[in-house]
Interface confidence: low
């Protein structure tokens, strides 16, 4: 239904508080370097304008599209050219090209200072002094660092952030109450951002069909009792929501997400028996809860898949009549029977089935040709099963830190051209699959592990896309979304790599390492490990382990010394010499 004024429509639907928050997120995700105060000023101007349109939808400019209104506002920023360089050229374009231009300039790794957490008392004072500004600052800082963060979900995080401060700033031990809550929000926030980044990459790089296939598989696993028509409707609506959010249309996205949650709750009897608790919650919690809801039980009376998709004489007829619908039905039927498979595996099976039908339906005897198609699935299923089994055994043997180190070595040897910070970040996250998924029973391991690895490898892909340095990474990232993980798994040591020149400065450490948190100290050691492998890609596990053990002992010794700095200088030289000898550098 057309509205005379889109901005008035969204303001009324969302309410002033959510409207302002979403406009702030949108602006911070576009202009990631702008100061907080500048964004707040722009948001206030847009909000005042929206209110005039609510009062009179025929008022001047109220009929303009949101892209036009927001783009015009962003282009009023005085320092656009100095701060953003060529992004300023976007302002010379007309909509919709201008918005596309802004989207292309979103930076997944903006050059922003790390967020340092102030003392608890300082934060509580700031919270009490001006709660509204404090919460806006949270939205701004997260949004500019995570330009694809799922905006309606960020509102949910902000609600929890506010609740944490409200509760803990009046607790007897503020720090004990607040810090674990903030840690949890930080970790969940990073995970949420990465998951959404994959959805946006799927839509933007591989198209709507790829995203819809993912959604059919995931929703069919989650709602196995729902009819195919119901799942298809949910997929269409969910695709619209994510297309909007990934496209910067945050007001429409939040509004449509709320409508989808409402629909799901009104029709839960035909969707899932697990939705009852979610549907009793307020809007933001409800939407989050639905997105995370556990898989419903499988219906008891599901017939064999072979009857409709292999044994039937109408397979090619059905396929020819409506290819995507027939493949969608196959994916739905397979996924609802297999909550124990990862979504990417289900998509590989569907792709194999599609390829077989394309070939066989043109053959002399189609049925004879595709009769054994399900046999082709066996190796595809076994590959991730075996990989997960091996890696969980390794994780259980080594523990998280050493498992991360094994992956650091493995991935640095595969793609040594990738920057050290990216290799450290990605390998650390890959290593977290152990603690996240290996504790699960076998029926839940593969969906947990392989779908998580898809999210982490997408981080590598988007960071690498900004500064491409490896043809192998580009190939694995662009050829097939569902085969990214098998592609990276299959990479061997890069024999074409010319080892990096040895630089003693890279391995020079100072007393400041002693005051770092355990996590930061691990990152320092893992950075050194990556550099070692880049210098000596043919080093054996045993050689690297020996050097890393010596390095750990060196840090421990010097951090206990009276004159730490002297110890780091003198013992560091000895360590570098010993390491060079051990590795033949």
């Amino acid at each position: 239904d057309a509205h005379k004024s889109e901005v008035a429509h969204r303001f009324k639907d969302l309410g002033e508080e959510n409207f302002k928050a979403l406009v702030l997120i949108a602006f911070a995700q576009y202009l990631q370097q702008c100061p907080f105060e500048d964004h707040v000023k722009l948001v206030n101007e847009v909000t005042e304008f929206a209110k005039t349109c609510v009062a009179d939808e025929s008022a001047e400019n109220c009929d303009k599209s949101l892209h036009t209104l927001f783009g015009d506002k962003l282009c009023t920023v005085a320092t656009l050219r100095e701060t953003y360089g060529e992004m300023a050229d976007c302002c010379a374009k007309q909509e919709p090209e201008r918005n596309e231009c802004f989207l292309q300039h979103k930076d997944d790794n903006p050059n922003l200072p790390r967020l340092v957490r102030p003392e608890v008392d300082v934060m509580c004072t700031a919270f009490h002094d001006n709660e509204e500004t404090f919460l806006k600052k949270y939205l701004y800082e997260i949004a500019r660092r995570h330009p694809y963060f799922y905006a309606p979900e960020l509102l949910f995080f902000a609600k929890r952030y506010k609740a944490a401060f409200t509760e803990c700033c009046q607790a007897a031990d503020k720090a004990a109450c607040l810090l674990p809550k903030l840690d949890e929000l930080r970790d969940e926030g990073k995970a949420s951002s990465a998951k959404q980044r994959l959805k946006c990459a799927s839509l933007q790089k591989f198209g709507e069909r790829a995203f819809k296939a993912w959604a059919v598989a995931r929703l069919s696993q989650r709602f196995p009792k729902a009819e195919f028509a119901e799942v298809s409707k949910l997929v269409t609506d969910l695709t619209k929501v994510h297309t909007e959010c990934c496209h910067g249309d945050l007001l429409e996205c939040a509004d449509d997400r709320a409508d989808l949650a409402k629909y799901i709750c009104e029709n839960q009897d035909s969707i899932s028996s697990k939705l009852k608790e979610c549907c009793e919650k307020p809007l933001l919690e409800k939407s989050h809860c639905i997105a995370e809801v556990e898989n419903d039980e499988m219906p008891a009376d599901l017939p064999s898949l072979a009857a409709d998709f292999v044994e039937s004489k109408d397979v090619c007829k059905n396929y020819a009549e409506a290819k995507d619908v027939f493949l969608g039905m196959f994916l739905y039927e397979y996924a609802r029977r297999h909550p124990d498979y990862s979504v990417v595996l289900l998509l590989r099976l569907a792709k194999t089935y599609e390829t077989t039908l394309e070939k066989c339906c043109a053959a002399a005897d189609p049925h004879e040709c595709y009769a054994k198609v399900f046999d082709e699935f066996k190796p595809l299923v076994e590959e991730p099963q075996n990989l997960i089994k091996q890696n969980c055994e390794l994780f259980e043997q080594l523990g998280e830190y050493k498992f991360q180190n094994a992956l650091l070595v493995r991935y640095t040897k595969k793609v040594p051209q990738v920057s050290t910070p990216t290799l450290v970040e990605v390998s650390r996250n890959l290593g977290k699959v152990g603690s996240k998924c290996c504790k699960h029973p076998e029926a839940k391991r593969m969906p947990c592990a392989e779908d998580y690895l898809s999210v982490v490898l997408n981080q590598l892909c988007v960071l690498h896309e900004k500064t491409p340095v490896s043809d192998r990474v580009t190939k694995c990232c662009t050829e097939s979304l569902v085969n990214r993980r098998p592609c990276f798994s299959a990479l061997e040591v890069d024999e074409t790599y010319v080892p990096k020149e040895f630089n003693a400065e890279t391995f020079t450490f100072h007393a400041d390492i002693c005051t770092l948190s355990e996590k930061e100290r691990q990152i320092k050691k893992q950075t050194a490990l990556v550099e070692l492998v880049k210098h000596k890609p043919k080093a054996t596990k045993e050689q690297l382990k020996a050097v890393m053990d010596d390095f750990a002992a060196f840090v421990e010794k010097c951090c206990k010394a009276d004159d730490k700095e002297t110890c780091f200088a003198e013992e560091g030289k000895k360590l570098v010499a010993a390491s060079q000898a051990a590795l033949g550098l």
């Epitope: 039980e297 219906p299 008891a300 009376d301 599901l302 064999s304 029977r337 297999h338």
Partner: nanobody, 115 residues
């Protein structure tokens, strides 16, 4: 590989009871709905009963409703069929299947109801 092994069949008088078991291996039993199917001599397979993966939802063929009870123990990877008030027409080979398939994937266990 997927394996389903039935046991508990035998000869019983009309009105008597039997409890069939089906031990599963080679797949994630707790993720799948399961069924009992039977095949009488000279007849095609007939679906008897089904249970969902969690054990909450059960279904029965009209011919056995009120007399048979399907259950499962996911920890033991075992499916059960408690058969009470048995009739001569219940005589058949009983076998378990994954989902609601009636395609035989196992040897089955013979149940004979006769006086």
């Amino acid at each position: 590989e997927v394996q389903l092994v039935e046991s508990g069949g035998g000869l019983v008088q009309p009105g008597g009871s039997l409890r069939l078991s089906c031990a599963a291996s080679g797949f994630t039993f707790g993720s799948f709905g399961m069924s009992w199917v039977r095949q009488a001599p000279g007849k095609g397979p007939e679906w008897v009963s089904a249970i969902d993966s969690g054990g909450a939802d059960t279904r029965y063929a009209e011919s056995v409703k009120g007399r048979f009870t399907i259950s499962r123990d996911n920890a033991k990877k075992t499916l059960y069929l408690q058969m009470n008030s048995l009739k001569p027409e219940d005589t058949a080979v009983y076998y378990c299947t994954i989902g609601r398939s009636t395609s035989r994937g196992s040897q089955g266990t013979q149940v004979t109801v006769s006086s």
